[in-house]
Interface confidence: low
């Protein structure tokens, strides 16, 4: 079931989504919020944590296909571990090889999410807008 | 409460959103779905109607601020009535003056939604992706 449905059969089952923090976006039982205040990566992470959420984690092109539509650039929860060279999410999981196209425009250890599943490497101290995500149980 | 929160106070009230058709986006109790199959305006309208929804109606920058983030161009439910010159939604209501920036790039009687509350006039017979919307009661 894609956000970009080719043709949806009817009748469609009506269902509730969530629970999410009030006025967050709910999609396939994940909660998302876009924050327009520019913060560096660490401040963005702290802001999400303060709301019982984390910076965006991209884990599935199917479950998160709404991210195809997002314009502009926003901090996500992906960081480069200089000691071993890997890209990891905040929860310590390794970035799957086919989820994001990583584009190294800048030297840095953090990444900005851009539409169509692209990640732009950026200096973690640069202020940017950010996306928080809360996975429902 | 804006999608672009400057800073969200905690604790946030957790709530369910909907009900919506399965796997649609739910935001502020409205349901949205983006369709990647290109159709002309009339076919897009029929597709939304077949799912008990309508083409996107923009009625509030506050309640629909997620639309700021949408990239690309998609049919919405706005049509030009040539006999009297007005722009109306499918439900017959007139377009409020400060909701959309209408840009006449083409001659036509239908409109494409583009990010940041812009509407591009287009020939209704041109195929485009489209946005369906269902307002919850």
């Amino acid at each position: 079931n894609s956000l970009f449905n080719q043709e949806v059969q009817i009748p469609l089952t009506e269902s509730y989504c969530g629970p999410c923090p009030k006025n967050w976006i709910c999609y396939k039982n994940n909660c998302y919020q876009f924050f327009n205040e520019s913060k560096n990566w660490y401040e963005s992470q702290a802001s999400c944590m303060s709301q019982n959420a984390s910076l965006l984690k991209v884990y599935s092109k199917e479950d998160q296909d709404l991210l195809k539509l997002v314009k502009s650039y926003h901090w996500m929860g992906l960081v480069h571990i200089p000691t071993n060279g890997s890209w990891q999410w905040e929860d310590g999981s390794i970035l799957s090889p086919n989820l994001l196209t990583i584009i190294e425009m800048q030297k840095g250890d953090c990444a900005l999410y851009a539409s169509s599943f692209k990640g732009y490497i950026e200096n973690c101290s640069i202020p940017n807008t950010y996306i928080c995500m809360q996975r429902t149980v | 409460n804006s999608l672009f929160n400057q800073e969200v106070q905690i604790p946030l009230t957790e709530s369910y959103c909907g009900p919506c058709p399965k796997n649609w986006i739910c935001y502020k109790n409205n349901c949205y779905q983006f369709f990647n199959e290109s159709k002309n305006w009339y076919e897009s309208q029929a597709s939304c109607m077949s799912q008990n929804a309508s083409l996107l109606k923009v009625y509030s920058k506050e309640d629909q601020d997620l639309l700021k983030l949408v990239k690309s161009y998609h049919w919405m439910g706005l049509v030009h009535i040539p006999t009297n010159g007005s722009w109306q939604w499918e439900d017959g209501s007139i377009l409020s003056p400060n909701l959309l920036t209408i840009i006449e790039m083409q001659k036509g009687d239908c409109a494409l939604y583009a990010s940041s509350f812009k509407g591009y006039i287009e020939n209704c017979s041109i195929p485009n992706t489209y946005i369906c919307m269902q307002r919850t009661v």
Epitope: - | T83, N84, G85, S86, S96, P97, T101, I102, E104
Partner: antibody, heavy 121, light 107 residues
């Protein structure tokens, strides 16, 4: 023929009020956002606000501050601008305008002839 | 509010000259820009809408271009009836705002 005919201007003392009106003919008044623009002598154009002929919905410039009120009479196809607490700074030519069919409410292809308001003691 | 800055404020030109007037918006207005001509004692007259679309009945010597924040009105060959004041207007968002005007005078 599509036309806007303005009436009402004149000389008024500071603190006074005036009602300017604009009568539409040759098109369906109900479907347009009728707009008011003013121009002080030797100066540029300044948008005041607009009112929808059918619904009566209104939008004003922020500087208006409640001193100006837009109204309309559907039966008479007339849009009016009530101006209160007038000062010398309000001395201007006042125009009503109608948007083009396809350009919606922000591009004006039909204008009234203008009506002069002079505020002086 | 979006500020519109027009330049020059006045210019002198001769019949047959190519005349260019510029208008700069304080923020991106997405091509939603109009140009009007106004003659003394008359109401403005729409020349160009949506930055580059020629209004019906307007001579083809008038053209508009631009995007983002910067826009230009060009008169390819100035005619006697073109001596007037020209205004740009942003049609992107309320409140609608106009440039200060450019007076085109006979040299």
């Amino acid at each position: 023929q599509e036309q806007l005919e303005q009436s009402g201007g004149g000389l008024v003392t500071p603190g006074g009020s005036l009602k300017l009106c604009c009568t539409a003919s040759g098109f369906d008044f109900n479907t347009f956002w009728m707009t008011w623009v003013r121009q002080a002598p030797g100066k540029g154009l300044e948008w005041i606000g607009c009112i929808h002929g059918g619904s009566g919905s209104r939008d004003y410039a922020s500087w208006v501050n409640g001193r100006f009120t837009l109204s309309r009479d559907i039966d008479q196809s007339t849009a009016c601008l009530q101006v209160n607490s007038l000062t010398a700074a309000d001395t201007a030519m006042y125009y009503c305008a109608r948007p083009g069919y396809r350009s919606w409410s922000k591009t004006f292809d039909l204008w009234g002839q203008g009506t002069m308001v002079t505020v002086s003691s | 509010d979006i500020q519109m800055t027009q330049s020059p404020s006045s210019l002198s030109a001769s019949v047959g000259d190519r005349v260019t007037i510029t208008c700069r918006a304080s923020q991106d207005i997405s091509g939603a820009l109009n140009w009007y001509q106004q003659k003394p004692g008359k109401a403005p007259n729409l020349l160009i809408y949506a930055a580059s679309s020629l209004q019906s009945g307007v001579p083809s010597r008038f053209s508009g271009s631009g995007s983002g924040t910067d826009y230009t009105l060009t008169i390819s060959s100035l005619q006697p009836e073109d001596f007037a004041t020209y205004y740009c207007q942003q049609a992107n968002s309320f409140p609608l705002t106009f440039g200060g005007g450019t007076k085109v005078e006979i040299k």
